[in-house]
Interface confidence: medium
């Protein structure tokens, strides 16, 4: 851990490791019963991860601040590096034990060593993210997260090269969400769908998260999204361009959608 190659590696946590990955309900965090969590993993060709599988993944950097179902009705989450808001300052599997009430609602930890990869953690100065299968249409029931973390002081210039997602009022069906942070909780920028290219977005800091979700019906052409690192500006011009440039875009959707 610590500072290496200009990157804070203690914050670079794996999105998927040793076949283990985190899943949440389409409707948001902590919405899955045990049966539903099991079904989510099985739908993707996997199964709920065991405690051992989750711990093995944690040991190679799998860190998620969200409690989820594991095999045999167990609930917990993997913490690589303790933080003030997650894991009670501890590392390891934060274990809520085997739940007597299988109707409790949590997220899910799935295990599938053969699952199609999408998303990940990116520290390169430039990269292009593509919807799974691009240039072919993406599939139903996809969830992908791309986490970007660049060198401290750099900012991220995000631009949309191709964009074609199913339309729905308020982008409730298929969408890309952008967050000006390293998670999908803070710094919400917007939700995007349709086939008009969203405007470029510039982060306020050195981190950004992209989330892609497709629902159970109707797909479209998909997307290519490029980011480029912007080197620190001189002190005299710092802070002048920290907002996104997306508010004029025709398919920019402001606000959270958790109430629907």
């Amino acid at each position: 851990w610590g500072f290496k190659d200009g990157i804070f590696h203690n914050s670079i946590w794996l999105e998927r490791a040793a076949g283990v990955y985190h899943r949440e309900a389409r409707s948001g965090k902590y919405k899955l019963t045990y049966a539903e969590a099991k079904a989510v993993c099985e739908f993707e060709g996997g199964h709920l991860a065991t405690y051992k599988q989750l711990e093995a993944a944690r040991k190679i950097g799998f860190h998620v601040c969200a409690a989820g179902w594991m095999a045999k009705g167990r609930v917990g989450y993997p913490i690589v590096k303790p933080g003030p808001n997650c894991g009670f300052g501890k590392t390891g599997i934060i274990d809520y034990g085997i739940r007597l009430n299988r109707s409790e609602r949590w997220d899910a930890y799935c295990y599938n060593p053969h699952a199609k990869e999408c998303g990940g953690v990116f520290t390169d100065p430039k990269q292009i993210f593509k919807s799974p299968g691009f240039p072919n249409e993406y599939e139903d029931n996809q969830i992908c997260y791309w986490h970007i973390r660049l060198k401290y002081g750099q900012r991220i210039h995000l631009s949309f090269l191709d964009f074609d997602l199913e339309d729905d009022p308020g982008c409730l069906a298929d969408y890309v969400e952008i967050y000006d942070s390293y998670d999908d909780v803070h710094g919400f920028v917007g939700r995007y769908c349709g086939d008009e290219l969203p405007d470029d977005i510039i982060s306020t800091g050195n981190v950004m998260t992209l989330k892609f979700l497709s629902d159970a019906s109707v797909t479209a052409g998909g997307f290519q999204i490029k980011y480029v690192a912007m080197d620190p500006v001189s002190k005299s011009s710092q802070g002048k361009n920290t907002s996104t440039t997306s508010t004029g875009n025709k398919n920019f959707l402001a606000g959270r959608f958790s109430h629907l």
Epitope: R191, C193, G194, T247, L253, G255
Partner: antibody, heavy 124, light 106 residues
Amino acid sequence: EVKLVESGGGLVQPGGSLSLSCAASGFTFTDYYMSWVRQPPGKALEWLGFIRHKAKGYTAEYSASVKGRFTISRDNSQSILYLQMNALRAEDSATYYCARLYYYGSPHWYFDVWGTGTTVTVSS
Amino acid sequence: QIVLTQSPAIMSASPGEKVTMTCSASSSVSYMHWYQQKSGTSPKRWIYDTSKLASGVPARFSGSGSGTSYSLTISSMEAEDAATYYCQQWSSNPPTFGSGTELEIK
């Protein structure tokens, strides 16, 4: 001519139920998302929910104020939209409109055709 | 949810007078739609996508704006324009309407 005509309104007691209908004509009903909007007397319009078209399996979305109490459904063979209202409250008193949703890319969604409206009064 | 505030709530104009009403959004929206409603009747689509006139709407009407500030303008008021006008957004769920501007003829 594209036309929407609501029916089923009336007086109902608090806690009661009521079902509203909206007969559609002049367009291919299955191709459109359909919505319900209400307007309390002398007040502004409020969106209640919508139901998607055939390609999306006729799934529905609701506003927070009616979710769990109101259900939108459709009979595509007869081109009728329904709003089933349960656990009615005094504040549900309003004129209820069905409206066709039109779009050509998000967020270009708007209500392009409105029904004539039917009045619901919730009072003891 | 995004709150749309319309002003003024009530206004009156003489025939031939220019009329402007505004709709302010609590957060930035991509487009604004406008509906006309006359007393005792259902709303009618009037202006969509901020500035496009619905079919049958006279050319004296226009719409403009961006971000959080939008407006509807009538270049020369006519008696038939007396109605309540509602703005509406669907840039974020749920879709919301403004409280309306009631336009009277003097």
